[in-house]
Amino acid sequence: LIIGFGISGKHFITVTTFTSAGNIGEDGTLSCTFEPDIKLNGIVIQWLKEGIKGLVHEFKEGKDDLSQQHEMFRGRTAVFADQVVVGNASLRLKNVQLTDAGTYTCYIRTSKGKGNANLEYKTGAFSMPEINVDYNASSESLRCEAPRWFPQPTVAWASQVDQGANFSEVSNTSFELNSENVTMKVVSVLYNVTINNTYSCMIENDIAKATGDIKVTDSEVKRRSQLQLLNSG
């Protein structure tokens, strides 16, 4: 969470940004809020990126002005025009690229003053893991798969019954490059599992952490997955 202040005359404009992460190949949002001016025609929103000449996006007089937009963002940006009235200056970024990572500035000008705040935008790939019982293995095994990760993550297994146990000796993890030659498919197999136990497959890089849980009993298999972005405000 980053709060920036600006001053014009004696009026401060508070602009708030949230560090966020983009999943490459998908659409992302760079979050920015401010106290909205009721005079919408007086609101100017500018998004800038460190090291880039020209603007990422500009919105003024109630509409986009892309005359100074840098070519790397052409056709990929939009503000939530109907939400500017409630102080949402967030930027929608289509088809996130690895090169979109960096420091962005959300700059706001209203009829009373101006202000800005920076945000750190990380890019990578992250996805939910799915755990299945691997019936092809010679012994009872669990197979944890996640289709897209970048940078290469670490993978660890845990179990509810054997808390604190080190499963690195009884697991095998591989990373398979996907067709676009950036992201990788993560596959980890855990051997010698026992029934009536809950196992967790944890995948983590510097952008995200994902966990897949599986509970295997005589009568059923229960699964749960969750994904958490790291260092997000």
């Epitope: 009026h11 106290e35 909205p36 001016d37 009721i38 005079k39 919408l40 025609n41 007086g42 007089e61 109630g62 509409k63 025009a81 109907d82 939400q83 009235v85 409630v86 102080g87 209203t110 009829s111 009373k112």
Partner: antibody, heavy 116, light 107 residues
Framework: EVQLLESGGGLVQPGGSLRLSCAAS????????MHWVRQAPGKGLEWVAS????????YYADSVKGRFTISRDNSKNTLYLQMNSLRAEDTAVYYC?????????WGQGTTVTVSS | DIQMTQSPSSLSASVGDRVTITCRAS??????LNWYQQKPGKAPKLLIY???NLQSGVPSRFSGSGSGTDFTLTISSLQPEDFATYYC?????????FGQGTKLEIK
């Protein structure tokens, strides 16, 4: 339930004063701008005043500028309209409304009658 | 000030009819236009915000279109509960201004 409830209306003589209140409930009042809108008997809607979430921006219609004051107390979830030097043409139902993408929540209105 | 002009001022229609109400701004207001419905003795109700977005809970027979200076509210198939007065409102700048209203009556 999201709700706005106006109070403070009544009969007042020309030149007199009234203070209208609007009590908000069911939402985070401090996150929203607010409006006062009025409607004279048999007439259309007329915007009166607006205040932003933290009172940083305040605007008035020319017809009430210098006579009416909009304010809010976020700790009490309440919006106010102080009306001084009232005139016959201020007679109307006064509504408070939440400023979102449109005036999306309205109170039931309170009637102000200015007459001698 | 931005003037908002609605037409027609009144309109008679039957249940099941398709009805269109227009609103014209005296200068460009981008897409910052809302539509409200008001029934006698009641507070207005937001139908459409930002020219074309249906407010939550509003039936899909209501739709809005337009940008710049010319806007339209359409009711695809009138229902008995739709007979009311409709207002457009610009929120591009202050003073916020409403149209004079369109009274929709049963034929």
């Amino acid at each position: 339930e999201v709700q706005l409830l106006e109070s403070g209306g009544g009969l007042v003589q020309p030149g007199g004063s009234l203070r209208l209140s609007c009590a908000a409930s069911g939402f985070t009042f401090s996150s929203y701008g607010m409006h006062w809108v009025r409607q004279a008997p048999g007439k259309g809607l007329e915007w009166v005043a607006s205040i932003s979430s933290s009172s940083g921006y305040i605007y008035y219609a020319d017809s009430v500028k210098g006579r009416f004051t909009i304010s809010r107390d976020n700790s009490k979830n309440t919006l106010y309209l102080q009306m001084n030097s009232l005139r016959a043409e201020d007679t109307a139902v006064y509504y408070c409304a939440r400023a979102s993408s449109g005036m999306d929540v309205w109170g039931q209105g309170t009637t102000v009658t200015v007459s001698s | 000030d931005i003037q908002m002009t609605q037409s027609p001022s009144s309109l008679s229609a039957s249940v099941g009819d398709r009805v269109t109400i227009t609103c014209r701004a005296s200068q460009s207001i981008s897409s910052y236009l809302n539509w409200y419905q008001q029934k006698p003795g009641k507070a207005p109700k937001l139908l459409i915000y930002a020219a074309s977005n249906l407010q939550s809970g509003v039936p899909s027979r209501f739709s809005g279109s337009g940008s710049g200076t010319d806007f339209t509210l359409t009711i695809s198939s009138l229902q008995p509960e739709d007979f009311a007065t409709y207002y457009c409102q610009q929120y591009y700048t202050t003073p916020l201004t409403f149209g004079q209203g369109t009274k929709l009556e049963i034929k």
